[in-house]
Interface confidence: low
Amino acid sequence: ARGPRCSQPGETCLNGGKCEAANGTEACVCGGAFVGPRCQDPNPCLSTPCKNAGTCHVVDRRGVADYACSCALGFSGPLCLTPLDNACLTNPCRNGGTCDLLTLTEYKCRCPPGWSGKSCQQADPCASNPCANGGQCLPFEASYICHCPPSFHGPTCR
């Protein structure tokens, strides 16, 4: 944080901050726990006030360190607690899938092992690794096909 010349008596850096000179000016370099020109204020973002993956920013409000939240897609409000109407609110991802918001109206499901499809609704036929001997499993319709390495053949490359 840029402030008075921190090498001057009475202007030293507080709370373990280090006084460093660069480009002809001096500034206190604060540890993560403190902010401000002399590292005098506790970092208000340490309490992780921004919810739902919101990003916390330290802001100066009339000389006092405060925070502001930048909300992730789909949330609003000072602490990002207010869900906006969005595609993930209806819990479209089934079988334990996680909903990632791409825009307010479009989502992508991250499916757990064994499931696939737009809403994780399809059992993954390759989840049990049915192809032996290094064969490559390719989902095909409701089942699978094994692409076998040389010298192996059959439905499961045995």
Epitope: T55, A68, S70, C71, A72, L73, S76, L84, L102, T103, L104, T105, E106, K108
Partner: antibody
């Protein structure tokens, strides 16, 4: 330092094909979603395509859907745009960009595509 | 598609002036708005994301505001290096769309 460098732009005839590349450095490429954006000769910016971290989700603008394909190779830190059935209205400078905070936080310098007979 | 309109295509101002660039959306976009700067050499940079947040390294003379359908970018003290074209962009819905740009010139 984040650096994105596009290449592959050229003069091509209508109906032709072209593949643009974007070499990324200075960040963990696989941890970011990426986009292509183009700038028309009239200086309008148009979002073209988007791809997520692993490349398994893509989205396209209506103007190019079915003709262009976005892809990525995380091992090579490279983003691609395969362009086919090119039209004169695809003439533009094509930029690749990285997405963070739901914004395109870094852009390349652009590569010029001219579609003309 | 959401249409983004920058009604002023060019703007002339003096060094030190306070300059405001406006942008309106064809429907409410819930503050999902970014601002970009394009220098005459074609270089594009993110200035502000999510309506009000300054991207790292962007001077504090830049600020953003707005809600609903109306948004603005303000430069509080115009400097020579601010000569550029400014674009707004919404990310509320695919396709992401940009305004037509506002070119800032020095009087």
């Amino acid at each position: 330092e984040v650096n994105l460098v596009e290449s592959g732009g050229d003069l091509v005839q209508p109906g032709g094909s072209l593949r643009l590349s974007c070499a990324a450095s200075g960040f963990t490429f696989s941890s970011y979603t990426m986009s292509w954006v183009r700038q028309t000769p009239e200086k309008r910016l148009e979002w073209v395509a988007y791809i997520d971290y692993g490349g398994d989700f893509t989205s396209y603008s209506d103007a190019i859907r079915g003709r262009f394909t976005i892809s990525r190779d995380n091992a090579k830190n490279t983003l691609y745009l395969q362009m086919s059935s090119l039209k004169s209205e695809d003439t533009a400078i094509y930029y690749c960009s990285r997405r963070r905070y739901d914004a395109m936080d870094y852009w390349g310098q652009g590569t010029s595509v001219i579609v003309s007979s | 598609d959401i249409q983004m309109t920058q009604s002023t295509s060019s703007l002339s101002a003096s060094l030190g002036d306070r300059v405001t660039v406006s942008c309106s959306a064809s429907q409410a976009i819930s503050n999902y708005l970014n601002w970009y700067q394009q220098k005459p050499d074609g270089t594009l940079k993110l200035l502000i994301y999510y309506t009000t947040n300054l991207h790292s390294g962007v001077p504090s003379r830049f600020s953003g505001s707005g809600s609903g359908t109306d948004y603005s970018l303000t430069i509080s003290n115009l400097e020579p290096e601010d000569i550029a074209t400014y674009y707004c962009q919404q990310y509320s819905k695919f396709p992401w769309t940009f305004g037509g740009g506002t070119k800032l010139e020095i009087k």
